[in-house]
Interface confidence: low
């Protein structure tokens, strides 16, 4: 066959679907690889062909579109399963071609099983809610296109495996789940089960997402440098190890980049010749506020090093702060006999 632009196996789009549920999978060519859509391709006389490789097999084979009740079908650029079976797991390829043009991409499809509490190997999206922030909603995801707007599905929401009904601060409202005031106790997995009729059959769509309650922007503050501070003086003798921790608290801010760095005499440590190492550790509170600690370390400090300016800097979307460490050279204690001699000499 003639040359085909092969985009390979698109592992970035690892598609997971539940067993015994409908699944609609769009050919990734039009979404991520080509600059035109399916309608344009179809109008230009291009044909979309589907085939697959079963799990643990090498052989590419055509998809059987003649199964009872049209279990697998294709509609425009969508491959439909009504419903999926466990052994539908494999690598699927969609190929767009005519006599002069060919482009194809493969993607993995995994059909997964769930237990009665909706536990499964499915990777769950995370939805962040601000703590005590007023009414916030989550929406049952990825259900568009499964049924026409004329069909009114029934939607049941669960927290963990428990049906949400008469909860104190969580109210199901169709496709939405409203949190009247989000609390730490609302952390957990939430599942919507959408049930709809189609051609005399009833289908269920199960969608689970993780809710994580995070710090509210109302309470967000610029970075706070806990160390260095004015109460601690780093007093060292030449040859000793100098260790200065820079500990910074960052309020949770959605999509904020938190940064901590040291400067020595106004320069980044990489830009100076001192043998300095920086070790960083990060911890998070339950509402994802962050504490970053960068420990500046000079194994054998010199007199020169003890005269330098060591400044800890921090930056988030809320602002930038800096704090200098108090570093000084320890004055050696005078020997006792000398001190006495000086004393006598003064009288």
């Amino acid at each position: 066959s003639e040359r085909c632009d092969d985009w390979g196996l698109d592992t970035m789009r690892q598609i997971q679907v539940f067993e015994d549920e409908p699944a609609r999978i769009k050919c990734p060519l039009f979404e991520h690889f080509l600059k035109f859509n399916y309608s344009t391709a179809h109008s230009a006389g291009l044909t979309l062909i589907w085939y697959w490789t079963r799990q643990d097999r090498d052989l590419e084979e055509p998809i059987n579109f003649r199964l009872p009740e049209n279990r697998i079908s294709k509609e425009k650029d969508v491959l439909w399963f009504r419903p999926t079976l466990l052994n539908d797991t494999g690598n699927y390829t969609c190929m767009l071609r005519n006599t002069t043009y060919c482009s194809k991409v493969a993607f993995p499809l995994e059909v997964v099983q769930k237990d009665s509490c909706f536990n499964s190997p499915m990777k769950l999206p995370v939805h962040k809610l601000y703590i005590e922030y007023g009414i916030q909603r989550i929406t049952c995801p990825n259900v568009d296109g499964y049924f026409p707007s004329s069909v009114k599905p029934t939607i049941t929401w669960y927290m963990g495996c428990y049906k949400i009904q008469n909860f104190n601060n969580v109210i199901p409202e169709g496709m939405n789940l409203s949190f009247l005031i989000a609390l730490i106790s609302n952390n957990g997995n939430y599942t919507c089960v959408v049930t709809y009729p189609e051609n005399g059959r009833t289908f269920h769509l199960t969608r689970t997402l993780t809710v994580k309650v995070v710090g509210s922007p109302k309470n967000a503050v610029p970075p706070v440098i806990h160390s260095p501070n004015d109460h601690v003086v780093y007093e060292k003798e030449p040859g000793e190890e100098l260790l200065i921790p820079c500990t910074v608290y960052f309020s949770f801010l959605m999509d904020s980049r938190n940064e901590v760095w040291w400067t020595i005499d106004g320069k980044k440590p990489d830009d100076i010749t001192i043998d300095v190492t920086i070790n960083e550790s990060i911890s998070h509170s339950r509402t994802e506020d962050e504490t970053r600690t960068q420990i500046l370390s000079i194994k054998k400090v010199t007199s020169e090093d003890l005269k330098r300016s060591y400044v800890c800097h921090a930056r988030s979307a809320k602002g930038e702060v800096a704090k200098a460490a108090k570093v000084k050279q320890k004055v050696p204690a005078p020997r006792y006999t000398v001190e006495l001699a000086c004393g006598f000499g003064a009288t």
């Epitope: 495996c161 428990y162 049906k163 009904q165 909860f167 601060n169 609390l183 106790s185 952390n187």
Partner: antibody, heavy 119, light 111 residues
């Protein structure tokens, strides 16, 4: 009149299994969540597990893998299967009804059944 | 895991006294709190749910208040039948919380 009556409690050896039952009369298990709560001699109340009106369940973290709550709506009976029993599981086990399908508060209780785990 | 801390663990009071029992949650639980009364050899009895709503058939001398982490059960005028142990309970159905749902109890004894 609504009644909950636990049964199945007895003296058992450590490491053995036991199934407790709670016969429910006067209400439909389809419409209420149900729970098991235990109380060790002279101690406070401790949640064991809860099952929703439509059969989904939660259990306390310490009970995971050992204790399983279930129900038979047709028999209007709640069960607690207890495996690998330990001396510290000795307690009176109460079955209780949730005020609704998932309110969390328990408005109706049985009189309890005593489980003693001893060698 | 959520911890519910009740205080005091016991108290002595006389008939007619105003009695206050407190319950503290280790984190914010909104109004997800219930109070129970238990007498020796009996099953617990639901007194209050939703932190402040009186359960059916419970005398009005019992009242509940609070939200978030701090809750109070008040008996405005203690009656002879009120000498019992009282428990608070977090009513949230979070898998992590069921094991820590009840407070340790407060025993109300006759002075």
């Amino acid at each position: 009149e609504v009644q909950l009556e636990e049964s199945g409690g007895r003296v058992v050896q450590p490491g053995t299994s036991l199934r407790l039952s709670c016969a429910v009369s006067g209400i439909d298990l389809d419409n209420y969540a149900m729970g098991w709560v235990r109380q060790a001699p002279g101690k406070g109340l401790e949640y064991v597990a809860v099952i929703s009106s439509d059969g989904f369940f939660y259990d306390a973290s310490w009970a995971k893998g050992r204790f399983t709550i279930s129900k038979a709506n047709s028999k209007n009976t709640l069960y607690l299967q207890m495996n690998s029993l330990r001396a510290e599981d000795t307690a009176v086990y109460f079955c209780a009804r949730d005020r609704g399908t998932s309110t969390g508060s328990l408005d109706l209780w049985g009189q309890g059944t005593l489980v003693t785990v001893s060698s | 895991e959520l911890v519910m801390t009740q205080s005091p663990s016991s108290l002595s009071a006389s008939v007619g006294d105003r009695v206050t029992i407190t319950c503290q949650a280790s984190e914010n639980i909104g109004n997800g709190l219930a109070w129970y009364q238990q007498k020796p050899g009996q099953a617990p009895k639901l007194l209050i749910y939703g932190a402040s709503t009186l359960a059916s058939g419970v005398p009005s001398r019992f009242s509940g208040s609070g939200s978030g982490t701090d809750f109070t059960l008040t008996i405005s005028s203690l009656q002879p039948e009120d000498f019992a142990t009282y428990y608070c309970q977090c009513t949230y159905w979070n898998p992590d919380y069921i094991g820590g749902a009840f407070g340790g109890g407060t025993k109300v004894v006759i002075k």
